[in-house]
């Protein structure tokens, strides 16, 4: 057998088993698992006298290694004294020594609970530059404890952590905080908080969760857009699965219909996101009539690391219907931007919230990328509203100064569309917007209100107006805010819109 250094263990009695009037007491030290012979055991008894006896070594049958016990008997004021057993094993090394310091007896104690907590990620699921690990050592009988942090089983520098102890009633708690750089945390190492107490070791370990554990995988199922449903007459629905860990098993998306009828062939797309997660979309064509008649479609998401399948279903929105009101406006010319103009379209008081917005010029639909449309928001009443914004160039309005904002919505009649035309220069083009004069006062609609009155002339505040409180001397509904134009103007001029 090769040379093996001993493991050393203190041998003590339970304090409650020692009579209070005992004048002497015996304690011991076990050295085990060493090879070859011998070990030398010496005792430090402090100020007390003691007699020692080392028992002959015995052979451990399985390994052929040795074990021996040394006993120390002390008399006098032993209860307050600490004793050190020093074991030397020269075959391991000329200076191989293991010291164990302990008292005569062990008291009953409540062991600690050890738990590591970790600081949060930011809102986007990303780790901050430093990560804090908090080791909570709680509920133990007060006494000396030693906390060591390990990285993959190797001792970490004590100066990287801070510790504090509190006592509540008869029990104590200690917490140790370790600060790590993001680089170390992300390197997939295991961090252990190791607590030594009353000769026992307690620990808890943690590491960055493996990417194979889906971080809150979510699934969403969209309804067909009104444009696809009523204009193109080729509606599709999309099942979107986000926050998947890449390349860790296949995600399956399965379509079905509540009626049990067969579904069409779907198309699938996978996209790696910048945060390292995978997004999977499956698009299913549905029948226009099936959808309008209220068929329910289901998307079932399965993945090896999901505890159970995710089910999402969609169907035509129920509830009251209301057609949209459409208002289109052109903003006045802005100094330095003579060759560009912004058109705005307020579409409001429609139900349900599904709506498609298009802009047309010269009877041709402009690409969706040309305009920006908000998500439907609830009005103060029961309907919804959206704003759509389109930038047009001088070349376009000089070719034909009429732009159309069209809303596609199931409640609009006769053909599920409502549209309004707007001109950049209404005076020249004879359009329906107001004539352009320098304003001295502007009326703005507060963004929190239900919507604009039907007679409103616009929805975008004059670029140089600022919002004031509603004024009693100004005509209009009380919920409208007043904006005062800073530049001088010759005649009163009103503009109603969002501040």
């Amino acid at each position: 057998a090769s040379t093996q250094s001993p493991s050393v263990f203190p041998l003590t009695r339970c304090c409650k088993n020692i009579p209070s009037n005992a004048t002497s007491v015996t304690l011991g030290c076990l050295a085990t698992g060493y090879f070859p012979e011998p070990v030398m055991v010496t005792w430090d008894t402090g100020s007390l006298n003691g007699t020692t006896m080392t028992l002959p070594a015995t052979t451990l049958t399985l390994s052929g290694h040795y074990a021996t016990i040394s006993l120390l008997t002390v008399s006098g004021a032993w209860a307050k004294q600490m004793f050190t057993c020093r074991v030397a094993h020269t075959p391991s090394s000329t200076d191989w020594v293991d010291n164990k310091t302990f008292s005569v007896c062990s008291r009953d104690f409540t062991p600690p609970t050890v738990k590591i907590l970790q600081s949060s990620c930011d809102g986007g699921g990303h780790f901050p530059p430093t990560i804090q690990l908090l080791c909570l050592v709680s509920g133990y009988t007060p006494g000396t404890i030693n906390i060591t942090w390990l990285e993959d089983g190797q001792v970490m520098d004590v100066d990287l952590s801070t510790a504090s102890t509190t006592q509540e009633g008869e029990l104590a708690s200690t917490q140790s905080e370790l600060t790590l750089s993001q680089k170390h945390w992300l390197s997939d190492r295991t961090y252990t908080c190791q607590v030594t107490y009353q000769g026992h070791t307690f620990e808890d370990s943690t590491k960055k969760c493996a990417d194979s554990n889906p971080r809150g995988v979510s699934a969403y199922l969209s309804r067909p857009s009104p444009f696809d449903l009523f204009i193109r007459k080729s509606p599709t629905i999309t099942c979107l699965v986000v926050d998947l860990a890449p390349s860790k098993g296949t995600v399956n998306l399965t379509w079905s219909r509540a009626s049990g009828k067969p579904v069409n062939h779907s198309t699938r797309k996978e996209e790696k996101q910048r945060n390292g997660t995978l997004t999977v979309t499956s698009t299913l064509p549905v029948g226009t009539r099936d959808w309008i008649e209220g068929e329910t479609y289901q998307c079932r998401v399965t993945h090896p690391h999901l505890p159970r399948a995710l089910m999402r279903s969609t169907t035509k929105t129920s509830g009251p219907r209301a057609a949209p009101e459409v208002y289109a406006f052109a903003t006045p010319e802005w100094p330095g931007s003579r060759d560009k103009r912004t058109l705005a379209c307020l579409i409001q008081n429609f139900m349900p919230e599904d709506i498609s917005v298009q802009w047309l010029h010269n009877e041709v639909q402009l690409p969706d990328a040309r305009h920006s449309t908000t998500q439907p928001r609830k009005t103060k009443g029961s309907g919804f509203f959206v704003f759509s914004r389109l930038e047009v160039t001088r070349a376009e309005w000089e070719q034909k100064d009429e732009f159309i904002c069209r809303a596609v919505h199931e409640a609009a009649s006769p053909s599920q569309t409502v549209q309004r035309a707007v001109s950049v220069n209404p005076g020249l083009a004879g359009g329906s917007a107001q004539s352009q004069r320098a304003p001295d006062r502007v009326l703005c609609h507060s963004g929190q209100q239900q919507g604009l009155p039907r007679a409103a002339g616009g929805s975008v505040p004059h670029p140089r107006c600022h919002c004031g409180a509603g004024r009693a001397d100004w005509p209009g509904p009380p919920e409208l805010d007043v904006c005062v134009e800073e530049a001088e103007g010759e005649a009163p001029w009103t503009w109603t819109g969002l501040c």
């Epitope: 200076d95 020594v97 060591t148 390990l150 990285e151 993959d152 089983g153 190797q154 001792v155 970490m156 520098d157 100066d159 990287l160 790590l180 750089s181 170390h184 190492r189």
Partner: antibody, heavy 119, light 107 residues
Framework: QVKLQESGPELKKPGETVKISCKAS????????MNWVKQAPGKGLKWMGW????????TYAEEFKGRFAFSLETSASTAYLQINNLKNEDTATYFC????????????WGQGTTVTVSS | DIELTQSPATLSVTPGDRVSLSCRAS??????LHWYQQKSHESPRLLIK???QSISGIPSRFSGSGSGSDFTLSINSVEPEDVGVYYC?????????FGAGTKLEIK
């Protein structure tokens, strides 16, 4: 007290193999990583790599991948550095150094083993 | 790899002098820089860790400062036994690298 005791000097020929030992005492061997550092005659210190004494996993600097191998004999609290196919440029003093994780603090060093490679 | 540039290469001082040894990193390494002393025919000895944290058993005349990429080891009042080579070491980025050293001599 913590002590790292390295084996004695070695004189080798090119192409031979050398195995240096580093025996640790005064602490729990498997709790601390062990680094190996090379110092060529009259030169500075060059980190070769380290071995996790708990898992046995070795990490090498780019320059020391291939002919160099770290190993352990945990029962004897000893770490080893083996250099195969020795070259003249391996002539140096090799130090073992105990490490505090995770920022490579080398708090205790062995006395060094001088390896001379000469034909 | 991060390069550490130490200056001066050699420093000749009189006992009692206050000296400063510089170490510059090729990129920021926060405070993860350690200093070692190596006397002739001896192994290196840890003097300072994390740029400024003192080590038990090291005389108080040794101190460190700096963060980012510029670091300084100061010896308040040089003693004759301080002769040797002083190395800085990057502990921040893999692999750990050492500076070429500053040799301290006594006039």
């Amino acid at each position: 007290q913590v002590k790292l005791q390295e084996s004695g000097p070695e004189l080798k020929k090119p192409g031979e193999t050398v195995k240096i030992s580093c025996k640790a005492s005064g602490y729990t061997f498997t709790n601390y990583g062990m680094n190996w550092v090379k110092q060529a005659p009259g030169k500075g210190l060059k980190w070769m790599g380290w071995i996790n004494t708990n898992t046995g996993e070795s990490t090498y600097a780019e320059e020391f991948k291939g002919r160099f191998a770290f190993s352990l004999e945990t029962s004897a609290s000893t770490a080893y550095l083996q250099i195969n196919n020795l070259k003249n440029e391996d002539t140096a003093t090799y130090f073992c150094a105990r490490e505090l994780r995770p920022y490579h603090v080398m708090d205790y060093w062995g006395q060094g083993t001088t390896v001379t490679v000469s034909s | 790899d991060i390069e550490l540039t130490q200056s001066p290469a050699t420093l000749s001082v009189t006992p009692g002098d206050r000296v400063s040894l510089s170490c510059r990193a090729s990129q920021s390494i926060s405070v993860y820089l350690h200093w070692y002393q190596q006397k002739s025919h001896e192994s290196p000895r840890l003097l300072i860790k994390y740029a400024s944290q003192s080590i038990s058993g090291i005389p108080s005349r040794f101190s460190g400062s700096g963060s980012g990429s510029d670091f300084t080891l100061s010896i308040n009042s040089v003693e004759p036994e301080d002769v040797g080579v002083y190395y800085c070491q990057n502990g921040h980025s893999f692999p750990p690298t050492f500076g070429a050293g500053t040799k301290l001599e006594i006039k």
